[in-house]
């Protein structure tokens, strides 16, 4: 890391250091020989995270309704407002700029990860021993029925689509 | 009462590396920055860099960049300084020095030492 | 880097007199300067910073001047106990730096 001219929390500004605005407020004016910085609140709506010598605060994100996306953790002067989405919708971005609906497992798969605000379904494609018959984005993949437990014989093999069918044993003298 | 007590004298070859420890009691540690400075025989003040206790945080002067390393155990009030590839003229004493409180400085970095340990005499000679 | 040069190299008084060692820097430090003594085999002590606040414990016969480039440092009536080398440090920006020193030895 190279040498720096000042303190942590100091920029160099006219071949001097100056304190740093902390988090949550903008620069004003820089110090002078006899004068510390000058900083001032970010207003409401802005925020700024880091110490800084930002004239302007950032504005607080916008969490758009018609985007699917509704306000998680609202912001402060400190801190960015944080956008999450509509139950049954998922960001499409680390930042969650905007929202996508969950993805439903087809069938033949079932969910191995139920979605969140900020990750979509994971599917996963049924084994051989399970199957599944419908399009979700919950369900997860089923066992097929054991005819055995249920004195009955498979008639018809399942796949991972479909349940195996079972019929009665043919009782053979 | 403040008091910085640096370890003892080190006799090292050409190209070895020195790690000398200072131990600060009577005030808060992680308050002030921690400087270093050398004093080569017969010669003036050197600056070497500085270490700032809270977050760990290190400043070095251009000429130890890549050869020196300062760090620091809060649990027991330490700060140490690692000298690599050893020459004969880094042959000094090097001490330790407190700056002033953080949070005092506005303008300017105003690193003045009040308090100073004692010295520790680093000797590289074959 | 900002470089201090500091003048004379040493000088030779007797108790009693008045002593004043000037430093330059190569750029502007505002009146980000401190004054040390340092005795032989003792680390140095501070005597005064932001170029004419005296440092506490410090006796009032030493005084600093100065701001920008041109600094001064003035022991008013040498002691005996003042003989010793003195340096200027500026405290502008990193990388401090000192001067060469000035030494104060009995006429």
């Known amino acids: 890391e190279p040498p720096t001219a000042c303190r942590e929390k100091q920029y160099l500004i006219n071949s001097q250091c100056c304190s740093l605005c902390q988090p949550g407020q903008k620069l004003v004016s820089d110090c002078t020989e006899f004068t510390e910085t000058e900083c001032l609140p970010c207003g409401e709506s802005e925020f700024l995270d880091t110490w800084n010598r930002e004239t302007h605060c950032h504005q607080h994100k916008y969490c758009d309704p018609n985007l699917g996306l509704r306000v998680q953790q609202k912001g402060t002067s400190e801190t960015d407002t944080i956008c999450t989405c509509e139950e049954g919708w998922h960001c499409t971005s680390e930042a969650c700029e905007s929202c996508v609906l969950h993805r439903s497992c087809s069938p033949g798969f079932g969910v191995k990860q139920i979605a969140t605000g900020v990750s979509d379904t994971i599917c996963e494609p049924c084994p051989v021993g399970f199957f599944s018959n419908v399009s979700s984005a919950f369900e997860k993949c089923h066992p097929w029925t054991s005819c055995e437990t249920k004195d009955l014989v498979v008639q018809q093999a399942g796949t991972n689509k479909t349940d195996v069918v079972c019929g009665p044993q043919d009782r053979l003298r | 009462q403040v008091q910085l007590v640096q370890s003892g004298a080190e006799v090292k070859k050409p190209g070895a590396s020195v790690k000398v420890s200072c131990k600060a009691s009577?005030?808060?540690?992680?308050?002030?920055?921690m400087h270093w400075v050398r004093q080569a025989p017969g010669q003036g003040l050197e600056w070497m860099g500085w270490?700032?206790?809270?977050?760990?945080?290190?400043n070095y002067a251009q000429k130890f960049q890549g050869r020196v390393t300062m760090t620091r155990d809060t649990s027991i009030s330490t700060a140490y300084m690692e000298l690599n590839r050893l020459r004969s003229d880094d042959t000094a004493v090097y001490y330790c020095?407190?700056?002033?409180?953080?949070?005092?400085?506005?303008?300017?970095?105003?690193?003045?030492?009040?308090?100073w340990g004692q010295g520790t005499l680093v000797t590289v000679s074959s | 880097d900002i470089q201090m040069t500091q003048s004379p190299s040493s000088v030779s008084a007797s108790v009693g007199d008045r002593v004043t060692i000037t430093c330059r820097a190569s750029?502007?430090?505002?009146?980000?300067l401190a004054w040390y003594q340092q005795k032989p085999g003792k680390a140095p002590n501070l005597l005064i910073y932001?170029?004419?606040t005296l440092q506490s414990g410090v006796p009032s016969r030493f005084s600093g001047s100065g701001s920008g480039t041109d600094f001064t440092l003035t022991i008013s009536s040498l002691q005996p106990e003042d003989f010793a080398t003195y340096y200027c440090?500026?405290?502008?920006?990193?990388?401090?730096?000192f001067g060469g020193g000035t030494k104060v030895q009995i006429k």
């Open positions: 020095a407190r700056d002033q409180p953080l949070g005092y400085c506005t303008n300017g970095v105003c690193s003045y030492f009040d308090y």
């Open positions: 009577g005030y808060t540690f992680t308050g002030y920055y």
């Open positions: 270490i700032n206790p809270d977050s760990g945080g290190t």
């Open positions: 750029q502007g430090i505002y009146s980000w």
């Open positions: 932001t170029a004419s």
């Open positions: 440090q500026q405290a502008n920006i990193f990388p401090l730096t």
